[in-house]
Each structure stands twice: as structure tokens, then as C-alpha cells.
């Protein structure tokens, strides 16, 4: 059958030894009683760690209580509480326990005390000169109106800078976009289609309302 010391009936770190009738606890300094359950430690002994406040225990017969500061627990405030286990940081932020305070270390693209502000969304994001904000892939960008460029569409862009006219066509900037003046033998908005010798072309059917060679809006 189970021995009298099974499960260690001695509290507060006491060691148990079997006796002919039952068991006996050898108590560590500062404790006594059948099961070492009575504390002989008083507040005068300074039993509270980590800045804990000791209350009571003025005489050996009355127990003391440690009131622990934030971040600590245990009868003597000896255990550090993992306050970060509450996961206070949003959007994948890392929790940092300074000791006196918790702080959130935010991933790129997020900010705020709890990393609650998404810097990559279009909310409150202004794209200048008629540009529109486009979200995607955890980032945002401005899709700029023709003639503008840059991160916020604040820079004037030359629509002809990218040489959009194929096959030697000449590009002209126009208030509504750009116009390609095609070299002989080519046609289309970007001079992309060769004109066949018989007068036909490899041009696909034009969308309604747009003649081949018209500027694209």
C-alpha cells in the first residue's frame, strides 16, 4: 500500500521521513508544525522579494502576507508573471516586458501602443492629382493619373518617357494622354500593328467608340 510519505505531506519544502506509526517532517528554518505549515518568519525577516510589501506577521503566531507588485506572484512574490502571455500586441507585434511596463514592438507597416494602426492601408491615405490608393500584399501604393508619378502622385511625369510607341513611332504628350505618330507601315494606338501590303492589317476589332490610332484615355 501507499507509504505515509507518498505525495510529500510536508509543506514549505519540509522533508518527510517514515516513522513506525506514521511520518515526521523535518522543517526548513522559519517553519514548524506537524506538516511545516506554520511560518515562524515575520515581516522583520524581509520575506517578500521583488519589492513586495509585507503585511502582518508581527509575532511568530501570526502569518505574514506579501502584497506583490505588478509582474510578480507567489507567497513571497518570488515568481515573475508572464504578462506577455495575455498577448496584448496586435498584428503580430512582439510583447516586451520592461519590468515596470509592457510595450509592443510592432512589425513593419504597423504602429501605435498596441500596434493597432495599419500604416499600409488606404484609410486616411491621400494620393495627389487624382490618383487612387490601391491596397495589396500588406502594402499600399498610389495608382497615378496620366501625367503624374511618384509615391503620392505628386511628381509630374512625362507620359512619353517610357517610349510607349512601338516600331519607331513618335510620341506626343497630350492633355488627355499621349498620341503616337506611327512610322510608315504601322498603325494602332501604340503603333503595334503592321499594315499588310494589300491594305489589310493585323489589327484586332476596335472597341466600340475607339478608332484605330485614337489616343487612349
Amino acid at each position: 500500500g501507499p507509504g505515509p510519505c507518498d505525495g510529500n505531506p510536508c509543506a514549505n519544502g519540509g522533508s518527510c521521513s517514515e516513522t513506525p506509526r506514521s511520518f515526521e517532517c523535518t522543517c526548513p528554518r522559519g517553519f514548524y508544525g506537524l506538516r511545516c505549515e506554520v511560518s515562524g518568519v515575520t515581516c522583520a525577516d524581509g520575506p517578500c522579494f521583488n519589492g513586495g510589501l509585507c503585511v502582518g506577521g508581527a509575532d511568530p503566531d501570526s502569518a505574514y502576507i506579501c502584497h506583490c507588485p505588478p509582474g510578480f506572484q507567489g507567497s513571497n512574490c518570488e515568481k515573475r508573471v508572464d504578462r506577455c502571455s495575455l498577448q496584448p500586441c496586435r498584428n503580430g507585434g512582439l510583447c516586451l516586458d520592461l519590468g515596470h511596463a509592457l510595450r509592443c514592438r510592432c512589425r513593419a507597416g504597423f504602429a501605435g501602443p498596441r500596434c493597432e494602426h495599419d500604416l499600409d492601408d488606404c484609410a486616411g491615405r491621400a494620393c495627389a492629382n487624382g490618383g487612387t490608393c490601391v491596397e495589396g500584399g500588406g502594402a499600399h501604393r498610389c495608382s497615378c493619373a496620366l501625367g503624374f508619378g511618384g509615391r503620392d502622385c505628386r511628381e509630374r511625369a512625362d507620359p512619353c518617357a517610357a517610349r510607349p510607341c512601338a516600331h519607331g513611332g513618335r510620341c506626343y504628350a497630350h492633355f488627355s494622354g499621349l498620341v503616337c505618330a506611327c512610322a510608315p507601315g504601322y498603325m494602332g494606338a501604340r503603333c503595334e500593328f503592321p499594315v499588310h501590303p494589300d491594305g489589310a492589317s493585323a489589327l484586332p476589332a476596335a472597341p466600340p467608340g475607339l478608332r484605330p490610332g485614337d489616343p487612349q484615355r
Epitope: F49, N50, G51, P69, P70, G71, F72, R80, P88, G93, L94, L96, D97, L98, G99, H100, A101, L102, R103, C104, R105, C106, R107, A108, A111, G112, P113, R114, E116, H117
Partner: antibody
Framework: QSVEESGGRLVTPGTPLTLTCTVS????????MSWVRQAPGKGLEWIGI?????DPYYASWAKGRFTISKTSTTMDLKITSPTTEDTATYFC????????????????????WGPGTLVTVSS | ALVMTQTPSSVSAAVGGTVTINCQAS??????LAWYQQKPGQRPKLLIY???NLESGVPSRFKGSGSGTEYTLTISDLECDDAAIYYC??????????????FGGGTEVVVK
């Protein structure tokens, strides 16, 4: 509650030097502590902190040049290989701040500060 | 990384006057800003935390304000004892650059 630095002296370049910050009136396990330095006639420059749990963090320029550690009552700053540019007064300070990072109450600050200890690096 | 830019580097005013010191953060710091006063040969002294909270024992002549990236320290009814260098400081917590507590470059206040 107070903090005080010690260990500052004249050293030759390359000779490691350890500064000590001794605290009284509060527990180092409860507070983060910081080192800040000030070169003669210059502004304040943050070096690094050590959290209540003992984790150090450094300014990018200070990584590898300094090591912060602590015991139950003192915090140390080791200048691993001092150069003349490390000549400065070194301050230690306790970090205070709102307990949790919430939008309504969110601040960090250094208080109290020690009087500083002067390190002179010269050949 | 977070950069704190303080202006002006020096300001002069007469006793009884008012001075304004500006601190600009390179990004939103959500009012997590402290102001310190340092006199020659002395340790820095905390004046204001959380952008606008006056530290205990600091005269109400010192006023902190601002939000987002722009912050101001205003000293009114200037006294000779206010002659010092003033520093702003914030905190920066990211996963990429660990943590930072950068100071502004400082502003010298001269009282005439």
C-alpha cells in the same frame, strides 16, 4: 529612490572598462534601467537598456561596443574596447512609464538620473 | 529608425518672457514624449512626460503640448533659473530595430 554611477576614470584606448550603477529605494527586478552618455559640450546620447527580467537592448551604434548586465542591486556597463570617441560623462537612469501600452495612457521617461561618472579615453 | 529634431538650437529671452521649443519626430510617436532640463555640470531632470504631463514639483510655467509628430515645450514667466539646455526624448518599439529611446539635439535657453 536614487541611482549613482561609479568606475569612471582615465583609460588608454582598447583597455576594457566597466562602469557600475548602484540603486537604492527600488528593486532592479521591477524596473528597466538605461545608460545614457554625454560627450563634453555635446547632447545626450542613449546607449541601451536592460529590462527588469535582465534582457539588454542597445542603440544600433552601440551594439558590440558596450555590454549591459546586472545583479540584484547593481547594473553594469562594460565598454569593450574604448576609443577616444567614448570620452564622455556616463549616466544611468531608471525607466518609468505607464504600466501597459494603451492608447489613453502611454508614456516612457527616465527618472531618477545619477550624477554621472566621467570616462576619459586617451593615450 | 526614429529621429528627433529639436529647434531652435538656441533661444534667448528676457526675464518674464516666454520661450517656445519645438521637437519634431520622424514618425508618429503617439504623444510618448518626455522633456528634460539640464544645467551645466548637472544631471538631466525630468520635466514633462506623455507630451503634456507635468512631473511632480515642476512649476506650472512649464507646459508641454503636441501630438502625432509635432511637440512643443513652452516656458512662460521666464526666470533666471530657467537658463539651461532642454532635451526632448521619445521611445521607438519595432521588431526590426529592437528598441530605441532617442533624444533631440537640445535647445539652449538663455535668459537676459
Amino acid at each position: 529612490q536614487s541611482v549613482e554611477e561609479s568606475g569612471g576614470r582615465l583609460v588608454t584606448p582598447g583597455t576594457p572598462l566597466t562602469l557600475t550603477c548602484t540603486v537604492s529605494g527600488f528593486s532592479l527586478s521591477r524596473y528597466a534601467m538605461s545608460w545614457v552618455r554625454q560627450a563634453p559640450g555635446k547632447g545626450l546620447e542613449w546607449i541601451g537598456i536592460i529590462t527588469g527580467g535582465g534582457d539588454p537592448y542597445y542603440a544600433s551604434w552601440a551594439k558590440g561596443r558596450f555590454t549591459i548586465s546586472k545583479t540584484s542591486t547593481t547594473m553594469d556597463l562594460k565598454i569593450t574596447s574604448p576609443t577616444t570617441e567614448d570620452t564622455a560623462t556616463y549616466f544611468c537612469a531608471r525607466m518609468i512609464g505607464s504600466e501597459y501600452a494603451s492608447s489613453s495612457e502611454y508614456y516612457d521617461a527616465f527618472d531618477p538620473w545619477g550624477p554621472g561618472t566621467l570616462v576619459t579615453v586617451s593615450s | 529608425a526614429l529621429v528627433m529634431t529639436q529647434t531652435p538650437s538656441s533661444v534667448s529671452a528676457a526675464v518674464g518672457g516666454t520661450v517656445t521649443i519645438n521637437c519634431q519626430a520622424s514618425q508618429n510617436i503617439y504623444s510618448n514624449l518626455a522633456w528634460y532640463q539640464q544645467k551645466p555640470g548637472q544631471r538631466p531632470k525630468l520635466l514633462i512626460y506623455g507630451a503634456s504631463n507635468l512631473e511632480s514639483g515642476v512649476p506650472s510655467r512649464f507646459k508641454g503640448s503636441g501630438s502625432g509628430t509635432e511637440y512643443t515645450l513652452t516656458i512662460s514667466d521666464l526666470e533666471c533659473d530657467d537658463a539651461a539646455i532642454y532635451y526632448c526624448q521619445s521611445a521607438y518599439y519595432t521588431t526590426s530595430v529592437d528598441v530605441l529611446y532617442p533624444f533631440g539635439g537640445g535647445t539652449e535657453v538663455v535668459v537676459k
